[in-house]
Amino acid sequence: EVEKTACPSGKKAREIDESLIFYKKWELEACVDAALLATQMDRVNAIPFTYEQLDVLKHKLDELYPQGYPESVIQHLGYLFLKMSPEDIRKWNVTSLETLKALLEVNKGHEMSPQVATLIDRFVKGRGQLDKDTLDTLTAFYPGYLCSLSPEELSSVPPSSIWAVRPQDLDTCDPRQLDVLYPKARLAFQNMNGSEYFVKIQSFLGGAPTEDLKALSQQNVSMDLATFMKLRTDAVLPLTVAEVQKLLGPHVEGLKAEERHRPVRDWILRQRQDDLDTLGLGLQGGIPNGYLVLDLSMQEALS
């Protein structure tokens, strides 16, 4: 807490300018009028205040607006936004996309903080829906934001937004989300050539159907085991040994280390043992030679 002290003679701030960087914390508290600060917030971001000085400026705004800052102030918070707590932000009513962009810009290049998450939540709730413009803005700043949306919300994501997604941004997506995102990614990257296409689509393949995996197996993509292990089990099961071998290329040797884990374990159980033996990896658990395999799902469809 900053001490309440009188402003020294001649130090009363007439405007928010760079001369204030030389003010001690107590001088800022005593000599800067909160209303002046609020009307000239756009200048604060251009002035190299220290974090301690920013604490004082925030304190002055908090006193002036105990119920929450008006949007005219919020839009110009700049780096002062980094000083806000989620509790502060919950008092705000942010309706302008420009305000949202201005604050996201401050946090650009960093992980989504609790402050940003709260800001986005307040903004989306204030708008009543997640419209395309908002989503474009959020995915531009935080591609990982996609994984925090429900499959229903993801259905409105434009394929163009997919271009901004980095592989690590999908780490927290579950299969239901990837089911929605994969077709959009496929559409977004459809005009790329084979190897470039695979690089881009790879992180979305957790939502790929069997037929797309079969198609990829014909393109010498050399999928790594980490990607293979994230594929949908139901999409992997129908693949033949030959198709998996082509899909993985030199990485096929990694199957041995993963033979106890899904989806490899389930896939092995569906393959003939003599087919598995052709891989020369010592994979065990396939259908013994001479056994007849009935596809019950097909039988049900025919009856």
Epitope: S19, F22, P48, T50
Partner: antibody, heavy 120, light 107 residues
Framework: QVQLQESGPGLVKPSQTLSLTCTVS??????????WSWIRQPPGKGLEWIGY???????YYNPSLKSRVTISVDTSKNQFSLKLSSVTAADTAVYYC????????????WGQGTLVTVSS | DIQMTQSPSSLSASVGDRVTITCRAS??????LNWYQQKPGKAPKLLIY???SLQSGVPSRFSGSGSGTDFTLTISSLQPEDFATYYC?????????FGGGTKVEIK
């Protein structure tokens, strides 16, 4: 580590302008965490703070010398400079440049100092 | 301006002695006080900042205390290299000001 080195004439005539330059090495003068100060010490006496500058060019001077002092910065050369006009014998002193930690205003490191004598 | 008064202005002590130097500010300066050591012909060297924080590389026999208007620099066991002049400096308000100095001499 950061080192500071003062340079300039050791003798200045009364009424003329004293000019000194401080060259910073081992670190950038554009660091946002520091001010760059000038401090002087008359022979056998104590220390007097003259003023400081931020890399952006903003300055703050000791009111007792404000009318005669100009501090400037050249970030491209990693230097800052002092000009003291209308000097008298009372301005004879060892002049130090120093790095000043923002918020707490402690001086570290200092230059080795340069004696400036005002005499005709 | 804030005036800084040091006492004593000089003192004589022997190696191994415990030495205490005091600094008083003309108004409360919280913990905005720094201590420096200066040897003849040399620039001052920062010992203590923010009243009690030991600067990196400074021997632990040096310590600082105090808050408000009264501050103390203590050398727990005086060493030959500690004979020098010591200055306090307030950084609570500009202009930044120094105490008049305390000269520690060999007894």
């Amino acid at each position: 580590q950061v080192q500071l080195q003062e340079s300039g004439p050791g003798l200045v005539k009364p009424s003329q302008t004293l000019s000194l330059t401080c060259t910073v090495s081992g670190g950038s003068i554009s660091s946002g965490d520091y001010y760059w100060s000038w401090i002087r010490q008359p022979p056998g006496k104590g220390l007097e703070w003259i003023g400081y500058i931020y890399y952006s060019g903003s300055t703050y001077y000791n009111p007792s010398l404000k009318s005669r002092v100009t501090i400037s910065v050249d970030t491209s050369k990693n230097q800052f400079s002092l000009k003291l006009s209308s000097v008298t014998a009372a301005d004879t002193a060892v002049y130090y440049c120093a790095r000043d930690r923002r918020d707490w205003d402690w001086f570290d490191p200092w230059g080795q100092g340069t004696l400036v004598t005002v005499s005709s | 301006d804030i005036q800084m008064t040091q006492s004593p202005s000089s003192l004589s002590a022997s190696v191994g002695d415990r030495v205490t130097i005091t600094c008083r500010a003309s108004q409360s300066i919280s913990s905005y006080l720094n201590w420096y050591q200066q040897k003849p012909g040399k620039a001052p060297k920062l010992l203590i900042y923010a009243a009690s924080s030991l600067q990196s590389g400074v021997p632990s026999r040096f310590s600082g205390s105090g808050s408000g208007t009264d501050f103390t620099l203590t050398i727990s066991s005086l060493q030959p290299e500690d004979f020098a002049t010591y200055y306090c400096q307030q950084s609570y308000s500009t202009p930044l000001t120094f105490g008049g100095g305390t000269k520690v001499e060999i007894k």
